[in-house]
Interface confidence: medium
């Protein structure tokens, strides 16, 4: 459509298979945890549900059964509130507003950026540049840091992180110099946007998400592959340096693909 300048990340959650579930830490038990729910986003593991009255937001753990994350009744900017984790779990009948969703300052008692980055050992914390951060607004930009999760609640409801599976990519080898540049190749931008939104969503186990395979200049490598699922290898395809699929190279997952003659680097 008109105006669709960028190829935005497409993130579809895949079913939680045995392999994914096998990597989960044992879930918390009572009395600390009265109800278990699936992690936010595409997470497969179980974590404690938030209880009635607990602070919540777009990127926090889920409210318990029968509860919904809502802005406070007098909240002037509901979208901003939810984006910033300033909602609360209440009876599911009422609807909220946008302020909660916007960029915001960390609330007192929330996990600080340094703590979050210290706790996160996955690709998301290594690659997403500091420029992808959120602001103060009714619709606050999604927070790249999970500062919406209260420290106090973290004691009851630990998040069980699962690292991204390692990929054959140079994405972690970008120099700090290139990180400071405002110019990136299209692959690098797609990767950042994908990881950025995943981080917003607190998706710590994004199985099924295609994080593109980039060269050091931020362009697409010739060969792109979907992530493997257990013993089943993800299918691969060939692209040019701008990520456009090249005809005649799509294996549809049947065989391995060789992109030898493709000019993409």
């Amino acid at each position: 459509g008109a105006g669709a300048v960028g190829a935005g990340p497409v993130v579809r959650c895949e079913p939680c298979d045995a392999r994914a579930l096998s990597q989960c830490a044992p879930p918390p038990t009572a009395p600390a945890c009265t109800e278990l729910v699936r992690e936010p986003g595409c997470g497969c593991c179980l974590t404690c549900a938030l209880r009635e009255g607990d602070a919540c937001g777009v990127y926090t753990e889920r409210c318990g059964t029968g509860l919904r994350c809502q802005p406070r009744p007098a909240e002037q900017y509901p979208l901003r509130a939810l984006l910033n984790g300033r909602g609360f779990c209440a009876n599911a009948s009422a609807a909220g507003s946008l302020s909660t969703y916007l960029p915001s300052q960390p609330a007192p008692g929330n996990i600080s950026e340094s703590e979050e980055e210290h706790n996160a050992g996955s690709v998301e914390s290594q690659v997403v540049p500091s420029t992808h951060r959120v602001t103060d607004s009714k619709f606050h930009p999604l927070h790249a840091k999970m500062d919406v999760i209260k420290k106090g609640h973290a004691r009851d409801s630990q998040r069980y992180k699962v690292d991204y599976e390692s990929q054959s990519t140079d994405t972690q080898n970008f120099s700090s110099e290139s990180k400071r540049e405002t110019e990136y190749g299209p692959c690098r931008r797609e990767m950042e946007d994908t990881l950025n939104h995943l981080k917003f969503l607190n998706v710590l186990s994004p199985r099924g998400v295609h994080i593109p395979n980039c060269d050091k200049k931020g362009f697409y490598k010739k060969k792109q592959c979907r992530p493997s699922k257990g013993r089943k290898r993800g299918f691969c395809w060939c692209v040019d340096k701008y990520g456009q699929p090249l005809p005649g190279y799509d294996t549809k997952g049947k065989d391995d693909v060789h992109c030898l003659s493709v000019q993409s680097q």
């Epitope: 300048v5 960028g6 777009v58 939810l82 909602g87 300052q105 420029t131 951060r133 602001t135 009714k138």
Partner: antibody, heavy 118, light 112 residues
Framework: QVQLQQSGAEVKKPGSSVKVSCKAS????????TSWVRQAPGQGLEWMGG????????EYAQKLEGRVTITVDESTNTAYMELSSLRFEDTAVYYC???????????WGQGTLVTVSS | EIVLTQSPLSLPVTPGEPASISCRSS???????????LNWYLQKPGQSPQLLIY???RRASGVPDRFSGSGSGTDFTLKISRVEAEDVGVYYC?????????FGQGTKVETK
Amino acid sequence: QVQLQQSGAEVKKPGSSVKVSCKASGGIFSTYVTSWVRQAPGQGLEWMGGIIPMFDTTEYAQKLEGRVTITVDESTNTAYMELSSLRFEDTAVYYCARAGGLSHFDYWGQGTLVTVSS
Amino acid sequence: EIVLTQSPLSLPVTPGEPASISCRSSQSLLHSNGNNYLNWYLQKPGQSPQLLIYLSSRRASGVPDRFSGSGSGTDFTLKISRVEAEDVGVYYCMQGLQTPWTFGQGTKVETK
């Protein structure tokens, strides 16, 4: 590739209501802000409000509060904007647009022309 | 609400020459996280707006490198290093720091 497909043009009488749809395909829907932006003939862009489908959370521009309602049907990834008590000055092209975590509209619908005429 | 003021409102350009548009905000758009939540859009005749620049200086995917954004706080600039015929249209700045999200009045760029 994310696409936002809007419903067709409408001609309405003053005092009536109009409901415009915006169907999203090819990307995450529920956690983004789907906003509505309008543009009167020869004029600039005006943000009307938005919704986060996951939480059914809405927010509206103050000048339109009470007249505009934004809803979603998550089963079809479709957002709706209903504007009631239409006035002549509501004649405009109405756009839906998606905003992600960095508060910018990265994808826009093609626009829906709503004409208020007696 | 935050008010954005663009200048000039009309900008006649010569293809191959540089062009510059200013956007001034009624309050700082610099967030404590170091980001400036200022975006630039181009609306070509008969089309939907398209994102050019976000976070003040980050070029959107697919946007030619002749477009660049700069500025911090309340003063921002969009520059086109060498205007091309396809760059004509109305340019809008928009702030994403606070809702209601607001736009500048627009700058109409047309060839001389």
